[in-house]
Each structure stands twice: as C-alpha cells, then as structure tokens.
C-alpha cells in the first residue's frame, strides 16, 4: 500500500541533490586551498542530518549546527558583499573582483545556491515531489532556515565597510522582508562595522534618477544608522560599464560617473 505523502506548495528537492552537493563540495575544496582539509562526505552527512527524518516545517537553526561547524570558513571580514534581489550581478562582480565575497562564494553558500531540499517526518526519504513554500506553507522549512542561518553568520562576521548591492528596478529597492532586510541588516555588528555602503543598480539605460533618495533607501539608512553604523549610498547608473570598469579600471571612460 503506497504511503500517504504530504503535498507542499513549493517545488520538490532538486534532482540528484545528494550527488550535486557532494560534487560541489569536492569542486570547491579543490579550488580553494584553505578548505582542502574539509571531508566532503562528512559535510554531506551533516547536511543530510539537518533535514532527513524531520518534519519539513519544524526545522531549526540548531539542526544545521553540525554542518555550520564543518563549513566554518574565514573570509576577509572587510571584503563582504551582500546583495538583495540582484544575485547574478553580485556574483559577476565577485568573479571579477576576486578579493570580495558574497555568501555564495563561501563553501556553504556555494553548496546550496539555487537548490531546494526537504525530507519527511520519520522516514529517511528525500522528498522530490514537493517542499514547503515559505509563504504558503511554513517559514521553518529546510531551505529557509539554512539561508537564515548562514546569512546571519555571514553578516555577523563582517567588519569595517560592508557593501550591499540592491536592485533599483524593483518597487521596493530595500525590502524589509528580504533575507538582507530581515536577517543580515540586523546582524551586522556595530562594534566591528563602521559603514554600510549601498550600491543601487539602475535597470533602465536612460534612468538618471537619484535612487539613493528612494523612500525605502531612506528607511534602510535610518535602520542602519540606529544600529550605530554609518550609511552611504551610490547609484550605479550603468551596471554593464560598472563591471567593465572593475575589469579594466585604467580605461579612460572609467573616470566618469557609472
């Protein structure tokens, strides 16, 4: 008799999830010498242990602690780039500016980027059919809790000047409900972080508005300032030129505003 299976509103676990995580771990540890000591089988076991046999709406940060411990990594705390709703450009940037890091440039972020996963209560099976949706089902699901946990730790580690890339094409350039707005902002440590610098990325070619004056940016400025962290903001009017100038800073066209 087939066992009844909970139907969730979100997509199921990514195909070949265990193999993908293991392969990514191996690849990452090969590329990053400082992480060569990591045993990828142990990493997978810890990852699996965080959600297998557990109700996918009852996952806690505690469940991920063994994985966090194994994935402990030191990145230069003054070279952190946060982002919100503009992941691709943030990643393109750190691929060029190799001394800066997004969360997905760390081992744990790299392992889980763009993946979905969940298990089922009291069985060792991975659910490939459906997983809980954050809004429609529950917020304490395996994926959301993972990103909340690693995002908090990443923000807590930051120091000096922290940069954040924000999408100027969205109605809410700064969204209090995003991971950046709900987790990272509140876990920057005022004792270590002097300034949060926002880069607002413009979408339209002819968009010359000062998006740093947007009401949501003013809201971010106030939230950050009240954490005793200074705030600054820059418009990136031409993201394509911005990336080009990161690649070739000596280019004569790179002295003008981008």
């Amino acid at each position: 008799v087939p066992r009844w299976r909970q139907q969730w509103s979100g997509p199921g676990t990514t195909k070949r999830f265990p193999e993908t995580v293991l392969a990514r771990c191996v690849k990452y540890t090969e590329i990053h010498p400082e992480m060569r000591h990591v045993d990828c089988q142990s990493v997978w076991d810890a990852f699996k242990g965080a959600f297998i046999s557990k109700h996918p709406c009852n996952i806690t940060e505690e469940d991920y602690q063994p994985l966090m411990k194994l994935g402990t990594q030191t990145v230069p705390c003054n070279k952190i780039l946060l982002w919100s709703r503009i992941k691709d450009l943030a990643h393109q940037f750190t691929q060029v500016q190799r001394d800066m890091f997004t969360l997905e440039d760390t081992l744990l972020g790299y392992l889980a980027d763009d993946l979905t996963w969940c298990g089922e209560f009291n069985t060792s099976k991975i659910n490939y059919q459906s997983c809980p949706d954050w809004r429609k089902d529950c917020s304490n699901n395996p994926v959301s809790v993972f990103w909340k946990t690693v995002s908090r730790r990443f923000a807590e580690a930051a120091c000096d000047v922290v940069h954040v890339m924000l999408n100027g094409s969205r109605s809410k350039i700064f969204d209090k409900n995003s991971t950046f707005g709900s987790v990272e902002v509140h876990n920057l440590q005022p004792e270590k972080v002097q300034t949060l610098e926002a880069w607002v990325i413009h979408g339209g070619r002819e968009d010359s508005r000062d998006l740093c004056q947007d009401p949501t940016i003013k809201e971010l400025e106030s939230i950050i300032s009240k954490r005793n962290i200074q705030f600054s903001c820059k418009n990136i009017y031409r993201p394509d030129k911005f990336l080009q100038c990161v690649k070739n800073p000596e280019d004569s066209s790179c002295t003008s505003e981008i």
Partner: antibody, heavy 114, light 111 residues
C-alpha cells in the same frame, strides 16, 4: 566643534545657529543638535545624517530646521518664543557612529526676550 | 513620545563608594541597546561615558560601567572619586526619531 550665532532676539525673529568643526569636515559625519534651558536638563532636538536626511523630536518638528553645507551644519529656529531661551549644543558622531555623541561644542546661548 | 525616567536624584556618595543610577524608558530603545550615558559638569558641555548600553567610550575610566537592555538601564560608578560630582543623563534612541530623548538627569554629590 563649535557653535555660533547665539544672541538676544525678540520673539518671532528667526535665528540661525551654525556648527563648525576644525580638523575634519562635518559633512562626513552625523550631527545632532541638543539644547539646555537655564538650570534644566538636556533636550534632543534633531539629527542630520551624512546624506542630509534629517529627523526631529516630535516637539521640535516645524519649529526647527537642520541643514548642512560642505563645512557647516545649521539649526534654524523659525519663530523663537521665550521657551526657546537655552544654550544650544551641536554634537558630532566623530570619528565613527551615528546617534552616539562623543564630540560636543561648548554651546551658544540664545536668549528670547521682548 | 517616549519618556526616560532617571532615579534617584540627587544621589550622594562617599569617596570610594559605589553609585547606581537607573534609567527607565516607557518603550524599548532601538535594538534593545541604543542608549548612551553622558556626564555634565556646570558650565561645560556633556561628555560621553557609555554607548550601546554597555560599551565604554574612549578615554573613560573603567570605574564607569553600563548595563541593561530594552527599557531598563543602569549606570554604575564604582570607587567614586570627587571628580565624579556631576549630573548624569541617559539618551534613548527609538524606532521613531520623534521619540528620541534624554532622561531628566541625576545629580551625583560626592561627600
């Protein structure tokens, strides 16, 4: 930092106080205005951020305006009353910080009297 | 608007003794810790002592300490010296800047 512009004014006469700094540029720091009536406690008036964004205490809204130039931060008292008689301090969040006030001027006295 | 109540005032202490000043807020300060303490002597501007509830400002003697979170905060002066005679103020910062305020002040008299 140092405040200037304090003087005797008649009620209703607008007055602008100026905060200047030596050794660093105020435009790169958060600056707060505070006042103290004779023999009384401190009152938080408002703050201006590096960006120029301003916030005011509820009681001060509409009565005071904080603005900045490249080198100074001003406090304008739109229509002073006798209750505005006080020593006015500007305080800078220097070298780091925002609402924390490590650097204060000596104050400038404003007397409102007819 | 937020109200910050400081108690007691005045407070008197002997040299070498300990003084505790309380600051109670009618609502929680930002991040539960955005409260600072200032010392003011007659004819002088205030001087920052403690910020973010418990962080000692640069150059301030370690006999000054701050504690508390949310709505209840304390400034403690241990091994009181005659130079500590002054009025002490707390400053609370709130989600709505309109509520930002100093406490009424506590005068410390050293005998």
């Amino acid at each position: 930092v140092e405040e200037s512009g304090g003087r005797l004014v008649t009620p209703g006469t607008p007055l602008t106080l100026t905060c200047t700094a030596s050794g660093f540029s105020l435009s790169r720091y958060y600056v707060t205005w505070v006042r103290q009536a004779p023999g009384k406690g401190l009152e938080w008036i408002g703050i201006i951020y590096i960006s120029g964004t301003t916030y005011y205490a509820t009681w001060a809204k509409g009565r005071f305006t904080i603005s900045k130039s490249a080198t100074t931060v001003d406090l304008r008292i739109a229509s002073p009353t006798t209750e505005d008689t006080a020593t006015y301090f500007c305080a800078a969040a220097w070298p780091v910080g925002t609402y924390v006030l490590p650097l204060w001027g000596p104050g400038t006295l404003v007397t409102v009297s007819s | 608007a937020a109200v910050l109540t400081q108690t007691p005032s005045p407070v008197s202490a002997a040299v070498g003794g300990t003084v505790t000043i309380k600051c109670q807020s009618s609502q929680s300060v930002v991040n539960a810790n955005n409260l600072s303490w200032y010392q003011q002597k007659p004819g002088q501007p205030p001087k920052l002592l403690i910020y973010l509830a418990s962080t000692l400002a640069s150059g301030v003697p370690s006999r000054f300490s701050g504690s508390g979170s949310g709505t209840q905060f304390t400034l403690t002066i241990s091994s009181v010296q005659s130079d500590d005679a002054a009025t002490y103020y707390c400053l609370g910062v709130y989600d709505d800047d309109g509520d930002n305020a100093f406490g009424g002040g506590t005068e410390v008299v050293v005998k």
